[in-house]
Amino acid sequence: AFGISGVQKYTRALHDSSITGISPITEYLASLSTYNDQSITFALEDESYEIYVEDLKKDEKKDKVLLSYYESQHPSNESGDGVDGKMLMVTLSPTKDFWLHANNKEHSVELHKCEKPLPDQAFFVLHNMHSNCVSFECKTDPGVFIGVKDNHLALIKVDSSENLCTENILFKLSET
């Protein structure tokens, strides 16, 4: 997984434009897979898209997402997730100009083509969990996480801290 230590490992990214007034600490290209090692894949056209959670063929390249890491403006209440007491947030982009968005009304994870500055719905608080896994909590709806439901990504409400380790909201990041 690519957690705080990974962020510190990479050089700071230089950006000509800032997002919601802040620039990323760094950016990282990684494949995204579930706790059970299924791959998150994307099929995009100009006017439509699909996001799949599936087993990949042996020779098939894994789709990658560009994770842009930000320090949030709010101090972290939890240990291990922040830098200097602040929460880490990420945006996830599978290709240029497209970002994952949280649709809290529909409890869905969507892909939107948009320009910077990105809306709050595109930001997720990054949590480093056990077994080299991470989870993504909606900035706009605390307690709601990106998760897997019926072989698709969805928003899943986590009621208690014990449920933070539930497998369907855990993801692995890999450079391969």
Epitope: A43, L44, E45, D46, K58, P94, T95, K96
Partner: antibody, heavy 126, light 106 residues
């Protein structure tokens, strides 16, 4: 509606050069990887070359490597194939093809061809 | 370089099932696509990622891929299905087509 319109074909002598163009419309051209595929008279399809939509990386079949150059002008929504040192065996209909999906980070060519042009005929003969 | 092998021709009676094979080393580890080409026309994608049909392609077209062989199946073949069919895969960002199979509807 996705449209791909090839042009630039014709008769050329062995050793000569030709530049093919493919004018694209109906989609965000810069987002998609594009390829050239050819078909010799009475023969099957042969992939010739492809170009990324992410970083303009280029890829070639061994049969044309060092002789053909693929390029794109995203501001003009146009794909090109510069063909040099042409041989009789390059005689074919040349199709421009668009990937089915927008190219993702990580690059490489790996998607099926969702859309094809009508083709332009290249004849190499003395 | 990677090679895909198809039978040159397949004959089928109307309403019957036509199966076209495409063989290659460890073919099942790759995603296969299939294209239909009618005389004087450009190819059309009929199957991608082994089994998926693009919108507008009839349900009678289906695909499978395992081991060393991918197969395109046309169930209830119609006269309009008479065409050349090509399989295609990517091998390290190099496109590879099979030699093509002419399907004749008797």
């Amino acid at each position: 509606e996705v449209q791909l319109l090839e042009s630039g074909g014709g008769l050329v002598q062995p050793g000569g050069s030709l530049r093919l163009s493919c004018a694209a419309s109906g989609f965000t051209f810069s987002s998609y990887a594009m390829s050239w595929v050819r078909q010799a008279p009475g023969k099957g399809l042969e992939w010739v070359s492809g170009i990324s939509g992410i970083d303009t990386s280029t890829y070639y079949a061994d049969s044309v490597k060092g002789r053909f150059t693929i390029s794109r002008d995203n501001s003009k929504n146009t794909l090109y194939l510069q063909m040099n040192s042409l041989r009789a065996e390059d005689t074919a209909v040349y199709y421009c093809a668009r990937d089915l999906w927008i190219q993702l980070w990580g690059g490489g060519l790996r998607y099926p061809f969702g859309y094809w042009g009508q083709g332009t005929m290249v004849t190499v003969s003395s | 370089s990677y090679v895909l092998t198809q039978p040159p021709s397949v004959s089928v009676s109307p309403g019957q099932t036509a199966s076209i094979t495409c063989s290659g080393e460890r073919m099942g580890d790759k995603y296969a696509a299939w294209y239909q080409q009618k005389p004087g026309q450009s190819p059309v994608l009929v199957i991608y990622q082994d089994t998926k049909r693009p919108s507008g392609i009839p349900e009678r077209f289906s695909g499978s891929n395992s081991g060393n062989t991918a197969t395109l199946t046309i169930s209830g073949t119609q006269a309009m299905d008479e065409a050349d069919y090509y399989c295609q895969v990517w091998d390290s960002s190099t496109g590879v087509f099979g030699g093509g199979t002419k399907v004749t509807v008797l």
